[in-house]
């Protein structure tokens, strides 16, 4: 077609090949590129930079080849608009470096960088690791040192070559509802670029005030609530080697609380409960006012919670085979250093076979049961019984 003689020729239904020498200095606004999956560029000495918006609109792109061209800079966010990119060939260009951020978030199956004057520096440690660990098909020549020719420098042994070290300092004292909490994020490392807090989990748990800058960032949590418990406060930092982040959780103390539900028959009987408090409260059951000693017939069983970001725990007082001797008043006492709470519920599992009308015949096969016992049984179940 006539258009092919200009700059780029279509290849199949979703490919584009741009090989006419010296006709491209940018990839921005390639015509008909909407459903492009393959782009091949060659012999474009004026194509020197690949910037953030250059590949906008190429959301379906799977394979990008830019070879034997003048590419000397690829922006860290150059592939932001091509998340499906899996094959990247930038061989035989003028690249001296390539940021780890450029390929972050991509699922590359192969990356070819051979024929570039890559300079050995901390910024290429990620690439060396990819090669060593076979993380994807990485093809480069030996990295060039500042000295003579092609030489491979063991970057990993260079102690100054590493991701930042991030530490968060927290208050040692216990934190209570309504307190203000100051956290400090200390960052160490070479060529630090940026750092910040990630506070997405904290919305509604406190007012947040950021302060300071690299290498020490401050965060004040004002008027904290108990909802802050189990929420991650994260500090991250980046340099040319990579990114590091660390998370902490602020423990906000508050008194125990407890709620009981009516006994329900599941595969066994369950008196459902919910307890809250920080630190996690200790629990004690009482039956008709006396301490209930747990056995494999009557015991506390916590429910596995999918929510790991809350302090409230749910569970059952599990009763296997309860009979009339288990009928009565059940009380759950929850206590922590900040307070205690109790809740009670009446439960009836079975009628007492010994409450009979004087007119009725006496059931001879029955003998008296110790009515003080709390470890007697219950009711058939259909599932595995602890």
């Amino acid at each position: 077609a006539a258009s092919c003689r200009e700059t780029c020729c279509p290849v199949g239904p979703s490919g584009l090949r741009c090989t006419r020498a010296g006709t491209l200095n940018t990839l921005r606004g390639l015509r008909g590129a909407g459903n492009l999956t393959e782009l091949y560029v060659e012999n474009q000495r004026d194509l020197q930079r690949l910037e953030f918006e250059d590949l906008q609109g190429l959301g379906e792109l799977r394979s990008l080849t830019i070879v034997k061209s003048g590419l000397r800079f690829v922006a860290p966010d150059a592939f932001h608009f091509t998340p499906r990119l899996s094959h990247l060939n930038l061989s035989s260009n003028a690249l001296e470096s390539l940021s780890w951020k450029t390929v972050q978030g991509l699922s590359l199956q192969d990356l070819t960088l051979s024929g570039n004057p890559l300079h050995c520096s901390c910024a290429l440690l990620w690439l060396q690791r990819w090669e060593q660990e076979d993380l994807c098909g990485v093809y480069t020549q030996k990295l060039q040192g500042s000295g003579s020719g092609d030489q491979f420098l063991p970057l990993g042994h260079n102690n100054s070559c590493g991701v930042p070290s991030v530490k968060i300092q927290m208050p040692n004292d216990s934190v209570e509802v309504g307190d203000d909490v100051f956290l400090q994020c200390q960052v160490e490392g070479q060529a630090l670029q940026q750092a910040d807090w990630i506070l997405t989990e904290l919305e509604g748990t406190a007012t947040m005030k950021k302060s300071g800058d690299l290498p020490s960032l401050g965060l004040t949590l004002v008027n904290v609530t108990s909802d802050l418990n189990k929420k991650n406060v994260t500090c991250w930092a980046e340099n040319d080697v990579g990114r590091a982040e660390v998370s902490v959780q602020v423990s906000v103390s508050f008194p125990a609380s407890v709620h009981l539900g009516k006994a329900v028959e599941q595969h066994h009987w369950c008196i459902p409960f919910s307890v809250d408090g920080q630190p996690a409260p200790s629990l004690r059951w009482f039956f008709n006012g006396s301490v209930l000693n747990e056995t494999s017939f009557i015991f506390t069983q916590f429910l596995e919670s999918a929510l790991t970001n809350e302090t409230m725990r749910h569970g059952c007082l599990r009763l296997n085979q309860p009979t009339h001797v288990n009928n009565g008043n059940y009380t759950l006492l929850a206590a922590n250093p900040y307070g205690q709470a109790a809740a009670s519920i009446m439960a009836a599992f079975m009628d007492n076979p010994f409450e009979f009308n004087p007119e009725d015949p006496i059931p001879v096969s029955f003998s008296p049961v110790d009515t003080n016992s709390t470890s007697r049984d219950p009711v058939e179940k259909k599932d595995e019984t602890p």
Epitope: F297, S375, D377, E384
Partner: antibody, heavy 118, light 107 residues
Framework: QVQLQQPGAELVKPGASVKLSCKAS????????MHWVKQRPGQGLEWIGE????????NYDEKFKTKATLTIDKSSRTAYIQLSSLTSEDSAVYYC???????????WGQGTLVTVSA | DIQMTQSPASLSATVGETVTITCRAS??????VAWYQQKQGKSPQLLVH???TLAEGVPSRFSGSGSGTQFSLKINGLHPEDFGSYYC?????????FGAGTKLELK
């Protein structure tokens, strides 16, 4: 499938102690109490006690309160019974067992034969 | 503690015969009885729980009955593999107790 693995045998001297293991697999270890049962050669079965792997809570038959100590290692999914001050009366097979669908022992270990001999 | 009194202590029978083993509890235990079979040098195997419910995989020639304090295990038409020891056990709270056992031998 549910498995309770126990070593085959232990030879111990009178007055010594021994710690027997029972490694569980094939079910949620912390959800089911582990029980221990003793059987002397040619004799019947005696329930020693039970332990809740979730919190280490134990109950013993009165007869074994000073003889046996039940413990749990959650990380290795293993239950233990320690028998102290051993005498010839303690020579027996010791089984670990757990309930199945109902409150009855549907699953047993192979048992460990403890022989107390000078 | 609940005592479980099992009888007979031993029993001789032939293949094809029907036998019954009984167990008496020292107090009302509703239907909370289990029965086990044990072969020489092996672990016990659950046959029956809740007095009459057969455990998974147990042949239908085994049957349990009773409630309150009187319980029995019946084997209808003995097979060669049925010989061994049998134990009853209450599962009505702790401490759990077993009967002394019945040794079923080939006549």
């Amino acid at each position: 499938q549910v498995q309770l693995q126990q070593p085959g045998a232990e030879l111990v001297k009178p007055g010594a102690s021994v710690k027997l293991s029972c490694k569980a697999s094939g079910y949620t270890f912390t959800s089911y109490w582990m029980h221990w049962v003793k059987q002397r050669p040619g004799q019947g079965l005696e329930w020693i006690g039970e332990i809740n792997p979730n919190n280490g809570l134990t109950n013993y038959d009165e007869k074994f309160k000073t003889k046996a100590t039940l413990t749990i290692d959650k990380s290795s999914r293993t239950a233990y019974i320690q028998l102290s001050s051993l005498t010839s009366e303690d020579s027996a097979v010791y089984y670990c067992a757990k309930y199945g669908n109902y409150v009855a022992f549907a699953f047993w270990g192979q048992g460990t034969l403890v022989t107390v001999s000078a | 503690d609940i005592q479980m009194t099992q009888s007979p202590a031993s029993l001789s029978a032939t293949v094809g015969e029907t036998v019954t083993i009984t167990c008496r509890a020292s107090e009302n235990i509703y239907s909370y009885v289990a029965w086990y079979q044990q072969k020489q040098g092996k672990s016990p195997q659950l046959l029956v729980h809740n007095a009459k419910t057969l455990a998974e995989g147990v042949p239908s020639r085994f049957s349990g009955s009773g409630s309150g304090t009187q319980f029995s295990l019946k084997i209808n038409g003995l097979h060669p593999e049925d010989f061994g020891s049998y134990y009853c056990q209450h599962h009505y709270g702790i401490p759990l107790t077993f009967g002394a056992g019945t040794k079923l031998e080939l006549k």
